[in-house]
Amino acid sequence: EEELQVIQPDKSVLVAAGETATLRCTATSLIPVGPIQWFRGAGPGRELIYNQKEGHFPRVTTVSDLTKRNNMDFSIRIGNITPADAGTYYCVKFRKGSPDDVEFKSGAGTELSVRAKPSAPVVSGPAARATPQHTVSFTCESHGFSPRDITLKWFKNGNELSDFQTNVDPVGESVSYSIHSTAKVVLTREDVHSQVICEVAHVTLQGDPLRGTANLSETIRVPPTLEVTQQPVRAENQVNVTCQVRKFYPQRLQLTWLENGNVSRTETASTVTENKDGTYNWMSWLLVNVSAHRDDVKLTCQVEHDGQPAVSKSHDLKVSAHPKEQGSNTAAENTGSNERNIY
């Protein structure tokens, strides 16, 4: 003998977040008379999604006109789907009863899976700057995606990195997931213009991965190299000494001239020149009045770069009746080369 069956033809339905899910249900008979209800989950804790007879379900619309007695279609549409809507939905036929309707037949259930796009990856670098040859860590985070399968890659200037660790949380079933990855990057002096990119690929992105970037200019500190040279005589009693500060980054730099250990002048780097690799060069000069000195003069160019301990380079200026043009940077003339001065 024929008996009403509740047919849910779709074992599973996959819907993108924000879209509408259609959950199909057909009763194979118009009798017994009684309403249809939709539930998420089974058993005593099941959640009522739609009741044909009563209630207000603002996100749910029926595909067919359920007020018509000859209708066998009890499909519903759920609007504005979010990952929290994931679960198994059951279409349940009730038989008219007194005082309450009695559950008669349930469909096999339709599993609703929600595809949610990952958020834009956020890449963050170390809190403090680091110098070339040091290894620094970058983290990349993306949230709110579903299903769990996701691919994360790291790149530095288009070259894929291999030294990274990635976790997807939670480990078990969830409505949505997060990914966290940490990559290790070795800095080089040429990295001012470099970028670290975190690339996330997910089924919802249709082959167009999301990228998060971090500029190594925010991370790297390239310490300057100093060179002090004595220029040809400008006048009988004056010598021009220059301090060339090369290949530094970032620009924040303060230079102090010392004559025999005494501060002569302090200045801040302003009109710098930029190198192709993004580092800066700067030059400062000191006009020394030789006639004011009886003895030899030790000139020191002391540089404090980006709040780091000062580095310095010295130059010995020989005082004689006729100051000759001196060679630059010879060992004899540059005592205390790169020595740390504490004044």
């Epitope: 118009l30 595909v63 006109d65 000859n70 209708n71 066998m72």
Partner: antibody, heavy 122, light 107 residues
Framework: QVQLVESGGGVVQPGRSLRLSCAAS????????MAWVRQAPGKGLEWVAQ????????YYADSVKGRFTISRDNSKNTLYLQMNSLRAEDTAVYYC???????????????WGQGTMVTVSS | DIQMTQSPSSLSASVGDRVTITCQAS??????LNWYQQKPGKAPKLLIY???NLETGVPSRFSGSGSGTDFTFTISSLQPEDIATYYC?????????FGGGTKVEIK
């Protein structure tokens, strides 16, 4: 006036395919479920397939399941029946019919086309 | 599937006669039953729906009754234009099924 006109019938060899069309006019096609019903020569009526008003669900007789596909294009007010792997027993006049009630899955048919003959023969 | 048994399979009556056709369902189908008329070479036409409701534009000499498993279709006064085959159809259960038809002729 309300009208359904079938086309696409003809003689076809067993195992081959055929597509029937049904052009609707005189009513809001997109509000009604539509069906195909066939009648073998000298025989009674047999329901073949049905589709919801919006095309979101389809229903088939066991005898055609997996071989026939019902579809509709509401923008063209047209119903289709794609018939594959045809057999001699599919020989019949094919009628398209309108469901009696709007926006439902019911199986009472108030408007019928004139029919199109499909002959499956080698 | 629900079996629909129509009787008689054919009948011959005079103009003005009362004609009765019966339709029996293999199980309870409530009142979800239609009656159709099909004239030779033409498409079926809905006459009665839900066992007893007359379709718009159908002459009142046609009527239907019954519920459960037993149904009756009546032409109160047979007219020459009523020569046709009449089919019952249940739509309580999927798939919808038709009776074998009753061919009505004029004596």
């Amino acid at each position: 006036q309300v009208q359904l006109v079938e086309s696409g019938g003809g003689v076809v060899q067993p195992g081959r395919s055929l597509r029937l069309s049904c052009a609707a006019s005189g009513f809001t096609f997109s509000s009604y479920g539509m069906a195909w019903v066939r009648q073998a020569p000298g025989k009674g009526l047999e329901w073949v397939a049905q589709i919801l008003y919006d095309g979101s669900n389809e229903y088939y007789a066991d005898s055609v399941k997996g071989r026939f596909t019902i579809s509709r294009d509401n923008s063209k007010n047209t119903l289709y029946l794609q018939m594959n792997s045809l057999r001699a027993e599919d020989t019949a006049v094919y009628y398209c019919a309108r469901d009696l009630t709007k926006y439902t899955l019911g199986f009472a048919f108030d408007i019928w086309g004139q029919g199109t003959m499909v002959t499956v023969s080698s | 599937d629900i079996q629909m048994t129509q009787s008689p399979s054919s009948l011959s009556a005079s103009v003005g006669d009362r004609v009765t056709i019966t339709c029996q369902a293999s199980q309870d189908i409530s009142n979800y039953l239609n009656w159709y008329q099909q004239k030779p070479g033409k498409a079926p036409k809905l006459l009665i729906y839900d066992a007893s409701n007359l379709e718009t534009g159908v002459p009142s000499r046609f009527s239907g009754s019954g519920s459960g498993t037993d149904f009756t279709f009546t032409i109160s006064s047979l007219q020459p234009e009523d020569i046709a085959t009449y089919y019952c159809q249940q739509f309580t259960y999927l798939p919808p099924t038709f009776g074998g038809g009753t061919k009505v002729e004029i004596k």
